[in-house]
C-alpha cells in the first residue's frame, strides 16, 4: 500500500492550502486591528483563561475524541488540529465581517477568538461523521462552508430573533450534527470487502479517545459559560454544566454495561455518553435554578446518549455510511434536541402569566430558530457534501478509507499495519 | 458603601476629544457590568455603553458607535469614557450606572442599581 | 422602541398614579423602572416588571399585559414628584422611553 497522497492530491492540498492562507494574511492585513482600548492586564489574563479552555477542548479533546480508529488515529487528531486553525482564522474574519465592519476595519479583541474557537468547534463536531472517508483538501472546504454558514446563521438569529450571545452559540449542537449527518449522507457509502477493520476501533487509540473524552469532560463548563454576560450567570452555567456531565458519566458507565447482554460497559458508548449532559444542559444552564434539575437532565441524556448509541448505529451505518465509533452526530442531534426543548419549556413557564397570546408568540419564534438552524445545517450540509463529491479533489478511493497510509509518511513500514 | 463618581466633564470644541472617569467604591469592577447613560439637556435619558464584567465585550449605542471607547482599569477600579469627534449633540450630562443582573425564567433581566451624580460635557465653539 | 404616556402629570399628594409604558416589538419581562429628580442620580425603582428594589417604597408597583407595562404609585408622597423613565434590557441598545415628568397640582 502506498504511503504517499496521489500525485493530483499532492499538487492540490499545498496549492489550494496555502493560497488560501495567503489570501487570509492579506485579508486581515487590509481589514483588521488589534483592539486598543485601555485594559488592565489581570482582566486580559482572566478573559484569555476562557479562550485556552476553549481551544483545550477543541485542539486535544475533540481531537483525541475522534482517534479511535484502529488506523486512522493520526490523520484524526492532527486533520483535526489542521481544521481548528484554519477554521479560527475564517471565523475571526467572517465573524468581524458580519458584525463589524460598515464602521470599517474589524477589531480583533480576545472575544473574538474566544467565539471564533467555539465556531470552529462546530466543524470538529460534524467531521466526526466524515472522518477517514476525506482527505485535507476536502476538509478545507467543509471548513469554510460549515463556518460560514455557522456564521450567518448566528447573524440572522441575532438580528431577526434578538438572541444574545449566549442562545446563539448554543445552537452549535444542533447545527453541526445535522450539518455532519447531512455531508456524511451525501459521500460514497458502502466500505469495500476487506476492508471493514479499519473502522473498527482498537485498544490504543481507544485509550486515547477516551483522554480526549475526559479532557472535554473536565471543560465543558468553560464551554458552556463562555459567552455570558454576567458573573452570576457564568457561575450558574458552571455549577450546572458540572452536575450534568458528573451525572452523565455515572449514567454512561451503569447505562452501558445494563445495555450489554453481559453487563460489559462499551468504550463508545462512554466516549460519547459522559458528555450527554453538558450538551442537553448548554441552551438553559444559566437558568437552571437548582443542582437536582441540572442532575436530572445529566441522568436524562445519559439514557438518551446510551439508547442512541445502541439503537442508532446500524440505521446510521446502513443510510449516512457512518461507522459504529463515529457516534458524535447522532448524540449532539438528539441531545441538542433535549436540550433546546427544555428551553422552551423554560420559555413557556416564563410568559404564563403574560397574557395577549405572548406564549404561544414566544414558542413559536423559538421554534422558528431552532428549525431555521436545523434547515440551514441540513442544506449547507448538502451543499458541502455535493461540493466533496467533484472530482477536483481526488477523495481517497473507498478501498483506503480510514487509513493514515494514505497520508502519511511511515518510515517503519515499509507495507501495511 | 457602593458609590459612583464621574469626572473628566468640560467644555470642548466640536471635533474635539474628552475622556471621563468614573470612580467605583464598595465594590470590584471586576464583577460588575458598567454602563454610561447621558441626558441632553431638555432631553430624557439615552444609553451610550456598556462593557462587561470581564471586560470581553463592549456594546455601543448607534449614535457613539466609532468615536467613543468604554474601557476600564480594574487596578484603579475606574470606569473610562474616551470621546472623540465631538459634536454638539453630543453636549449633555454623563451617567455612569452599575450592571446588575437576575435570574428570569427564560433568560436573565439586566438593570442599573447604582448610578453617579454625573458630569457635564458641553461641546460648544 | 418605547412610548411612554403620558409625557407629563399634574397630581395631588395621595393620589393613585398610573405610567405607562408601551414596547414596539415583544420585550418579555425585560422591562425597568427608573425615578430622576434634576441634579440627582437617577435611582432604580423596579426591575424585570414587577419587582422591588430593595429600599424602594411599597407604594410603588408594575406590572405587565402584553407589550404593555405599567407603573403605578398608590398613594402619591411629595417626594414623588419627578419624572420616570422605562427602560428595556431584552436587547442592546437599552432604550428609554421618552419619559414622564409627574408634577404637583
Known amino acids: 500500500m502506498s504511503s504517499k497522497y496521489p500525485r493530483s492530491v499532492r499538487r492540490c492540498l499545498p496549492l489550494w492550502a496555502l493560497t488560501l492562507e495567503a489570501a487570509l494574511i492579506l485579508l486581515f492585513y487590509f481589514f483588521t486591528h488589534y483592539d486598543a482600548s485601555l485594559e488592565d492586564q489581570k482582566g486580559l489574563v482572566a478573559s484569555y483563561q476562557v479562550g485556552q479552555d476553549l481551544t483545550v477542548m477543541a485542539a486535544i479533546g475533540l481531537g483525541f475524541l475522534t482517534s479511535s480508529f484502529r488506523r486512522h488515529s493520526w490523520s484524526s487528531v492532527a486533520f483535526n488540529l489542521f481544521m481548528l486553525a484554519l477554521g479560527v482564522q475564517w471565523a475571526i474574519l467572517l465573524d468581524g465581517f458580519l458584525s463589524q465592519f460598515p464602521s470599517g476595519k474589524v477589531v480583533i479583541t480576545l472575544f473574538s477568538i474566544r467565539l471564533a474557537t467555539m465556531s470552529a468547534l462546530s466543524v470538529l463536531i460534524s467531521v466526526d461523521a466524515v472522518l477517514g472517508k476525506v482527505n485535507l483538501a476536502q476538509l478545507v472546504v467543509m471548513v469554510l462552508v460549515e463556518v460560514t454558514a455557522l456564521g450567518n446563521l448566528r447573524m440572522v438569529i441575532s438580528n431577526i430573533f434578538n438572541t444574545d450571545y449566549h442562545m446563539n452559540m448554543m445552537h452549535i449542537y444542533v447545527f453541526a450534527a445535522y450539518f455532519g449527518l447531512s455531508v456524511a449522507w451525501c459521500l460514497p457509502k458502502p466500505l469495500p470487502e476487506g476492508t471493514e477493520d479499519k473502522d473498527q476501533t482498537a485498544t490504543i487509540p481507544s485509550l486515547s479517545a477516551m483522554l480526549g473524552a475526559l479532557f472535554l469532560w473536565m471543560f465543558w463548563p468553560s464551554f458552556n459559560s463562555a459567552l455570558l454576560r454576567s458573573p452570576i450567570e457564568r457561575k450558574n452555567a458552571v455549577f450546572n454544566t458540572y452536575y450534568a456531565v458528573a451525572v452523565s458519566v455515572v449514567t454512561a458507565i451503569s447505562g452501558s454495561s445494563l445495555a450489554h447482554p453481559q453487563g460489559k460497559i462499551s468504550k463508545t458508548y462512554v466516549h460519547s455518553a459522559v458528555l450527554a449532559g453538558g450538551v442537553a444542559v448548554g441552551t438553559s444552564c444559566h437558568l437552571i435554578p437548582s443542582p437536582w434539575l441540572a442532575m436530572v437532565l445529566g441522568l436524562v441524556a445519559g439514557l438518551i446518549s446510551v439508547g442512541g448509541a445502541k439503537y442508532l448505529p446500524g440505521c446510521c451505518n446502513r443510510v449516512l455510511g457512518i461507522p459504529h465509533s463515529s457516534i458524535m452526530g447522532y448524540n449532539f442531534s438528539l441531545l441538542g434536541l433535549l436540550g433546546e426543548i427544555i428551553y422552551i419549556v423554560l420559555l413557556v413557564l416564563d410568559t404564563v402569566g403574560a397574557g395577549n397570546g405572548m406564549i404561544g408568540f414566544q414558542v413559536l419564534l423559538s421554534i422558528g430558530e431552532l428549525s431555521l438552524a436545523i434547515v440551514i445545517a441540513l442544506m449547507s450540509g448538502l451543499l458541502t457534501g455535493l461540493l466533496l463529491n467533484l472530482k477536483i479533489w481526488k477523495a481517497p478511493h473507498e478501498a483506503k478509507y480510514f487509513d493514515d497510509q494514505v497520508f502519511w509518511k511511515f518510515p517503519h513500514l515499509a507495507v501495511g499495519f | 458603601q457602593v458609590k459612583l463618581l464621574e469626572s473628566g466633564g468640560g467644555v470642548v470644541q466640536p471635533g474635539g476629544s474628552l475622556r471621563l472617569s468614573c470612580e467605583a467604591s464598595?465594590?470590584?469592577?471586576?464583577?460588575?457590568?458598567m454602563h454610561w447613560v447621558r441626558q441632553a439637556p431638555g432631553k430624557g435619558l439615552e444609553w451610550v455603553a456598556l462593557?462587561?464584567?470581564?471586560?470581553?465585550?463592549?456594546s455601543y449605542a448607534e449614535s457613539v458607535k466609532g468615536r467613543f471607547t468604554i474601557s476600564r482599569d480594574t487596578s484603579k477600579n475606574t470606569l473610562y469614557l474616551q470621546m472623540r469627534s465631538l459634536s454638539a449633540d453630543d453636549t449633555a450630562v454623563y451617567y455612569c450606572?452599575?450592571?446588575?443582573?437576575?435570574?428570569?425564567?427564560?433568560?436573565?433581566?439586566?438593570?442599573?442599581?447604582?448610578w453617579g451624580k454625573g458630569t457635564t460635557v458641553t461641546v460648544s465653539s | 422602541v418605547l412610548t411612554q404616556s403620558p409625557s407629563s402629570l399634574s397630581a395631588s399628594i395621595r393620589d393613585r398614579v398610573t405610567i405607562t409604558c408601551r414596547a414596539s416589538?415583544?420585550?418579555?419581562?425585560?422591562l425597568n423602572w427608573y425615578q430622576h429628580k434634576p441634579g440627582t442620580a437617577p435611582k432604580l425603582l423596579i426591575y424585570?416588571?414587577?419587582a422591588l428594589q430593595s429600599g424602594v417604597p411599597s407604594r410603588f408597583s408594575g406590572s405587565r399585559s402584553g407589550t404593555d407595562f405599567t407603573l403605578t404609585i398608590s398613594s402619591l408622597q411629595p417626594e414623588d414628584f419627578a419624572t420616570y423613565y422605562c427602560?428595556?434590557?431584552?436587547?442592546?441598545?437599552?432604550?428609554f422611553g421618552q419619559g414622564t415628568n409627574l408634577q404637583i397640582k
Open positions: 424585570a416588571v414587577s
Open positions: 427602560q428595556q434590557s431584552y436587547s442592546p441598545p437599552y432604550t
Open positions: 450606572a452599575r450592571d446588575k443582573a437576575v435570574r428570569g425564567i427564560s433568560r436573565y433581566n439586566y438593570y442599573m442599581d447604582v
Open positions: 416589538q415583544n420585550i418579555g419581562s425585560y
Open positions: 462593557i462587561w464584567f470581564d471586560g470581553s465585550i463592549r
Open positions: 464598595g465594590f470590584t469592577l471586576r464583577s460588575s457590568g
